[in-house]
């Protein structure tokens, strides 16, 4: 059977009026996985994002991360898009530097 | 194949409202994002907003704030767009589009004419 | 409110010849938002180019597009009789999202 990920944004300061926003997908098997950010829907090109490589995570599931860096004040126009076993959904920048959890069910 | 299907040509009077649908197939409903763009006669394109149907967020153009609403209805897969307090410069095609994975509107709904007469 | 200039506001041509279409923007657009359409009589738009120089789905080789910045060109290297069209630019790069008031190609 399938585990659907678990997915958590998380933004960080990166230079003076721009942030850094990652999103991580963790727990999640069979390792096929689509993790990529969205500006007003529309995904981002690859040379905008940088993504992590989808590895295991001990437990006979995998982890992997997509980040991109966007000016403040833009967020709410950011969404991280997750794909995976049919399954999809989006998950938006946290404000402040809270976390946003979302476990994709089935 | 992938269409978005609108509700058919209105007829309103100024101070009325109305509401216009779009039903997308040939895809999952909630994993792009709707646009709404209008068009008024003989003129070029105007954005009105966006709403992302998976977790709801709406962003609108500043000019639509106040008379424009979108909403979805996931259980028919059906997205909508009502306009208020219309006059007779909102005589329009108002359109429905698709977010892509690589431009803001690859597929397009038909058009729907709204006419504002008294 | 990035303002998308497109010129000429018409150009007469005949089938077999060359069409070379401009979009000005206001402001900067990196080329990953600059996207162009295609729109025939009582047609809906249809997404023709996409970042600037990528041929949508279905899209014939003929059309180009190129440029960066703030100045953008789509380019018909051989104009065919379904080519006959209303073109706009649009940028997804800032709100709100904007096109250009179009550029109608008609036969001379």
């Known amino acids: 059977g399938s585990v659907p990920p678990m997915v958590n944004v998380t933004r960080s300061e990166a230079s003076e009026g721009n942030i850094t926003v990652t999103c991580r997908a963790s727990s999640f098997y069979p390792r096929n996985i689509t993790l990529t950010w969205r500006q007003d829907g529309v995904s981002l090109s690859h040379d905008t994002q940088q993504w992590g490589d989808v590895l295991p995570d001990g437990n006979g599931t995998y982890q992997t991360w997509v980040a991109t860096r966007i000016c403040q004040g833009e967020e709410q126009r950011f969404t991280c898009y997750m794909e995976h076993s049919g399954n999809h959904s989006t998950h938006p920048v946290p404000s402040g530097n809270s976390h946003h959890h979302h476990h994709h069910h089935h | 194949e992938i269409q978005l299907v609108q509700s058919g040509a209105e007829v309103k009077k100024p101070g009325a409202s109305v509401k216009v649908s779009c039903k997308p197939s040939?895809?999952?409903?909630?994993?792009?994002?709707i646009y709404w763009v209008r068009q008024a006669p003989g003129q070029g394109l105007e954005w009105i907003g966006y709403?992302?149907?998976?977790?709801?967020?709406?962003i609108y153009n500043q000019q639509f704030k106040d008379r424009a609403t979108l909403t979805v209805d996931k259980s028919t897969s059906t997205a909508y767009l009502e306009l208020s307090s219309l006059r007779s410069e909102d005589t329009a095609v108002y359109y429905c589009?698709?977010?892509?994975?690589?431009?803001?509107?690859?597929?397009w709904g038909q058009g729907t004419l709204v006419t504002v007469s008294s | 409110e990035i303002v998308l200039t497109q010129s000429p506001a018409t150009l007469s041509l005949s089938p077999g010849e060359r069409a070379t279409l401009s979009c000005s923007a206001s402001?900067?657009?990196?080329?990953?938002?600059l996207h162009w359409y295609q729109q025939k009589p009582g047609q809906a738009p249809r997404l023709l180019i996409y970042?600037?120089?990528n041929l949508a789905s279905g899209i014939p080789a003929r059309f180009s597009g190129s440029g960066s910045g703030t100045d953008f060109t789509l380019t018909i290297s051989s104009l065919e009789p379904e080519d006959f069209a209303v073109y706009y630019c649009?940028?997804?790069?800032?709100?709100?999202?904007?096109f250009g008031q179009g550029t109608k190609v008609e036969i001379k």
């Open positions: 589009s698709r977010s892509g994975e690589r431009s803001n509107f690859d597929y």
């Open positions: 970042r600037t120089s």
């Open positions: 709403i992302d149907p998976y977790i709801g967020r709406i």
């Open positions: 402001s900067s657009i990196s080329s990953n938002y």
């Open positions: 040939g895809y999952a409903f909630t994993s792009n994002n």
């Open positions: 649009q940028q997804g790069g800032s709100l709100p999202l904007t």
